[in-house]
């Protein structure tokens, strides 16, 4: 359920508020609907960087849970093959705040277009 993914993103944003994490993360800020699964997989990969950089058990657990929820939601869509989409490394690097903002935006796209 994508709304539960949103809930975990809110928890992560709450948890990192008091931390200073300098990491920049590959961020898709203008997702084409035909590339949304590819973009989501990039977001999930980059989310693990936040988990590692924070060194925080609560963040680690929330990230782990979010990834499971998101992968479950993606698999319920069936095996979607997307072509012509950007590789993660081709995306713009942004700070954590902007990354999370764009992450919420793409999850909302999955909700809105379901």
């Amino acid at each position: 359920n994508w709304v539960n993914v949103i809930s975990d993103l809110k928890k992560i944003e709450d948890l990192i508020q008091s931390m200073h994490i300098d990491a920049t993360l590959y961020t898709e800020s203008d997702v084409h609907p035909s590339c949304k699964v590819t973009a989501m997989k990039c977001f999930l990969l980059e989310l693990q960087v936040i988990s590692l950089e924070s060194g925080d058990a609560s963040i680690h657990d929330t990230v782990e849970n979010l990834i499971i929820l998101a992968n479950n939601s993606l698999s319920s869509n069936g095996n979607v093959t997307e072509s012509g989409c950007k590789e993660c490394e081709e995306l713009e690097e942004k700070n954590i705040k902007e990354f999370l903002q764009s992450f919420v935006h793409i999850v909302q796209m999955f909700i809105n277009t379901s």
């Epitope: 809930s7 084409h32 903002q101 935006h105 909302q108 796209m109 809105n112 277009t113």
Partner: antibody
Framework: QVQLQESGPGLVKPSGTLSLTCAVS?????????WSWVRQPPGKGLEWIGE???????NYNPSLKSRVTISVDKSKNQFSLKLISVTAADTAVYYC????????????WGQGTLVTVSS | SSELTQDPAASVALGQTVRITCQGD??????ASWYQQKPGQAPILVIY???NRPSGIPDRFSGSSSGNTASLTITGAQAEDEADYYC???????????FGGGTKLTVL
Amino acid sequence: QVQLQESGPGLVKPSGTLSLTCAVSGGSISSSNWWSWVRQPPGKGLEWIGEIYHYGYTNYNPSLKSRVTISVDKSKNQFSLKLISVTAADTAVYYCAREGIGWPSFDYWGQGTLVTVSS
Amino acid sequence: SSELTQDPAASVALGQTVRITCQGDTLRNYYASWYQQKPGQAPILVIYGKNNRPSGIPDRFSGSSSGNTASLTITGAQAEDEADYYCNSRDSSGKNLVFGGGTKLTVL
């Protein structure tokens, strides 16, 4: 600076169709944002009508869904609202607004246009 | 019935602090945003996300959330802060946007 401007008839007859257009300037309707219509009956609160993404995806308020259509015209950088079978209860100030990226918000609003439903 | 509930009215003495609240189960999943609306004018976004202010919004406005409640705090209220305040978020499905009923703030 993004600006939004609503236009359309200020008076619609009962059982008729309300049609409004929102012209977007200072930004592209083909940005990553969703675009919404919101209304406010005289002396009452705000009510969300629906939203559109430039690829044509739409979502509507369940209470209005059977009567509402929102469309987008990328060539004119505008989006439109159509509400059918109107009654006096649809009399309101109608606003168009741009949704922010990420968490729910409306970061830019039109100035609003009053539509009265009356014979 | 709205998924977001606000008290219809609040008041604050000039220069004092006031907190306006918004309640709803959906706020466990989503942050709320807050709008100020003065008579005859369009709403203006004052707070969005965890506690973000758009440029031009004074720093006396702040936002917070806990559980199913979001709050807008005005620290050192000014006469020009007298207005209606609305919260906004998504509903429990995540698909639809919803507004609270609004709080009319009077500055005494």
